[in-house]
């Protein structure tokens, strides 16, 4: 058993059928010695009284918010959460495997630059009594500071039968250089807890590997004379690490037909435009990737041909 | 420890050129391994991160652009040795930090040269022969060097005497080229900063 | 203690449907996952699915995915095996099994695919 | 396919020490607890060892398994008549639990 925060603890169980589970002592907080009662939850049944009660925790219905009563007056909580343990393996209820970049991905995070902010996101399906906390660092046995904010619903949506909620949190590095070459991973650490369940999911990364640029701004065409050919033009996201010069950007530029099975035309260039031939009827789509480390591409910026 | 006299090249930039090749060699290596050791611990959540050039070289701060020198977290070991995005080599003391910039680069390369060269004559007496370090990515190290145009100490290729465990050395392998293709990376915005200066 | 008692066994011409059942008694069954192992004559033993407590999230072995199904009904205590399309090479003793670090196995059933 | 290698057969003589190896990967026994199961002709198997090296109540203090690296043991010291079995590793590879990896199995003889 261990504390999370203030009167709340957690307690670890092989969780298998008939399992023995784990003997807790609970200790009332307060001086008082005599005629201290204990209860859980709603109920009113006194499980047993002084000022320490021993109780066998086996599954949920053994967690909860247990209370010490003096004469009707409540001296202390201490609400009691179950932390699975399956054939050597935590938990994993809670959160959805995304399965990308592989399987057994609960928690994904992302960079538009290289100052050290980044964002995670997970994914679930349980919609009430779920509360999240996250924590990071760089490395892990001498741990620098990433402060991270708190996670919040960033979408809803509806997968055949079921709602899909997700969740995210902002996280900046303390003190980042963006020219920095990365030698221990910055750790995200997400507590969740769902009714009387407690999980926790971790996940390790270079801010190097999670780069997604934004995509090019201001993207335009410009005819060319008496051809059939466009200039098409752009900029670097306003959100990308400065100076560009130092950090390149590479660009792919699309020409693409109204119907998906139609060839696309796809041209490769480190400078901010090219020149293609414009399809009736197609659009122009260009992308941004780190120039020097093949971290992933943005999302497409678009424009019509016509 | 004394820096190698510099005469950097004004026409900076065939280095430009080598340092892409270099990225690409290195990547290329680096992608090698990972497949032809697919079951030593060769990937970058697997292996421990380790800079054979740490308090050796200050590449990431000697070469670090003007712009970023505003950024406190940047500058926390050292003076304001940053290369410059003026004219190149207009004054001395620009002339004096790209000097110091391209040293490091030069001495990082050197430093890898040596220990590629090392683990290359280990990799060679592997019973198994499973991997040995691509010639074309020596090859490139090399140009680029000779690109720098620095003169400096030869240093002398380690030998062994000992049998060589030849799983620490594939780990080792993996080690070397993760950081060098970091260094690669490094390298390469240098030049391209360099370049547009 | 806890039980599991296997049933539906048999024999059955490839191609055809069968459902294993496996009730559960002695433990809250609601609580815990499941699989369904296999073993075929004179063979290894074979995972053949998994499906969580709550029946959220259900797993397949790739030679079965597509063609079986595992289900359970928590009310009645009871984990089932839908088997569709069988094939020759599904001829095995089928056992369901708890999840945990200490399990519990069923008696095991025969499915016999033959024509 | 099998993942988890076993060797086909082991035999000893009654009394002597039987060991049976079960070799993996680094995202399976390299990262994730070993139990070994005892299979008796007709029967459901057993479990003998969890954890790489607990034995549950009621299996004899002579089984005992032991993991190093990407490969994990079971030792029968002074294997008797009734030890006679057939003997599986099981564990999980991290990409893709909860599916069970078994290892291809061991026929243990016991010889005279």
């Known amino acids: 058993i261990w504390e999370l925060k203030k009167d709340v603890y957690v307690v670890e169980l092989d969780w298998y059928p008939d399992a023995p589970g784990e003997m807790v002592v609970l200790t009332c907080d307060t001086p008082e010695e005599d005629g201290i009662t204990w209860t859980l939850d709603q109920s009113s049944e006194v499980l047993g009284s002084g000022k320490t009660l021993t109780i066998q925790v086996k599954e949920f219905g053994d967690a909860g918010q247990y209370t010490c009563h003096k004469g009707g007056e409540v001296l202390s909580h201490s609400l009691l959460l179950l932390h699975k343990k399956e054939d050597g393996i935590w938990s994993t209820d809670i959160l959805k495997d995304q399965k990308e970049p592989k399987n057994k991905t609960f928690l994904r995070c992302e960079a538009k630059n290289y100052s050290g902010r980044f964002t995670c996101w997970w994914l679930t399906t349980i919609s009430t009594d779920l509360t999240f906390s996250v924590k990071s660092s760089r490395g892990s046995s001498d741990p620098q500071g990433v402060t991270c904010g708190a996670a919040t619903l960033s979408a809803e949506r509806v997968r055949g039968d079921n709602k899909e909620y997700e969740y995210s949190v902002e996280c900046q590095e303390d003190s980042a250089c963006p020219a920095a070459e990365e030698s221990l991973p910055i750790e995200v650490m997400v507590d969740a807890v769902h009714k009387l369940k407690y999980e926790n999911y971790t996940s390790s990364f270079f801010i190097r590997d999670i780069i997604k640029p934004d995509p090019p701004k201001n993207l335009q065409l410009k005819p060319l004379k008496n051809s059939r050919q466009v200039e098409v033009s752009w900029e670097y996201p306003d959100t990308w690490s400065t100076p560009h010069s130092y950090f390149s950007l590479t660009f792919c530029v699309q020409v693409q037909g109204k119907s998906k099975r139609e060839k696309k035309d796809r041209v490769f260039t480190d400078k901010t435009s090219a020149t293609v031939i414009c399809r009736k009827n197609a659009s122009i789509s260009v992308r941004a990737q780190d120039r020097y480390y093949s971290s992933s591409w943005s999302e497409w910026a678009s424009v019509p041909c016509s | 420890r004394n820096l190698p006299v510099a005469t950097p090249d004004p026409g900076m930039f065939p280095c430009l050129h080598h340092s892409q090749n270099l990225l690409r060699a290195v990547s290329n290596m680096l992608q090698k391994a990972r497949q032809t050791l697919e079951f030593y611990p060769c990937t970058s959540e697997e292996i421990d991160h380790e800079d054979i050039t740490k308090d050796k070289t200050s590449t990431v701060e000697a070469c670090l652009p003007l712009e970023l020198t505003k950024n406190e977290s940047c500058l926390n070991s050292r003076e304001t040795s940053f290369i410059t995005n003026g004219s190149c080599l207009a004054s001395r003391k620009t002339s004096f930090m790209m000097a110091l910039c391209l040293s490091s680069i030069y001495e990082d390369l050197k430093m890898y040269q040596v220990e590629f060269k090392t683990m290359n004559a280990k990799l060679l007496m592997d019973p198994k022969r499973q991997i040995f370090l691509d010639q074309n990515m020596l090859a490139v190290i090399d140009e680029l060097m000779q690109a720098l145009n620095f003169n400096s100490e030869t240093v002398p290729q380690k030998s062994s005497l000992e049998e060589p465990d030849f799983y620490k050395t594939k780990i080792k392998l993996c080690i070397l080229l993760h950081a060098f293709r970091i260094r690669a990376v490094t390298i390469d915005r240098v030049m391209s900063y360099l370049n547009a200066s | 203690q806890v039980q599991l008692v296997q049933s539906g066994g048999g024999v059955v011409q490839p191609g055809r449907s069968l459902r294993l059942s496996c009730a559960a008694s002695?433990?809250?069954?609601?609580?815990?996952?499941m699989h369904w192992v296999r073993q075929a004559p004179g063979k290894g033993l074979e995972w053949v699915a998994f499906?969580?407590?709550?029946?959220?999230?259900?797993y397949y072995a790739d030679s079965v995915k597509g063609r079986f199904t595992i289900s359970r009904d928590n009310s009645k205590n009871t984990l089932y095996l839908q088997m569709k399309s069988l094939r020759a090479e599904d001829t095995a003793v089928y056992y369901c099994?708890?999840?945990?670090?200490?399990?519990?196995w069923g008696q095991g059933t025969m499915v016999t695919v033959s024509s | 396919s099998y993942v988890l290698t076993q060797p086909p057969s082991v035999s000893g003589t009654p009394g002597q020490r039987v060991t049976i190896s079960c070799s993996g990967g680094?995202?399976?026994?390299?990262?994730?607890?070993v139990k070994w199961y005892q299979q008796l002709p007709g029967t459901a198997p057993k479990l003998l060892i969890y954890?790489?090296?607990q034995r549950p109540s009621g299996v004899p203090d002579r089984f005992s398994g032991s993991k190093s690296g990407t490969s994990a043991s079971l030792a029968i010291t002074g294997v008797q008549a009734e030890d006679e079995a057939d003997y599986y590793c099981q564990s999980y590879d991290r990409g893709t639990h909860p599916a069970l990896l078994f290892g291809t199995g061991t026929k243990v003889t016991v010889l005279g």
């Open positions: 680094r995202s399976n026994i390299g990262s994730i607890t």
């Open positions: 954890g790489n090296d």
């Open positions: 499906i969580r407590y709550d029946g959220s999230n259900k």
């Open positions: 002695g433990f809250t069954f609601s609580s815990y996952g």
């Open positions: 099994k708890t999840h945990g670090s200490h399990d519990n």
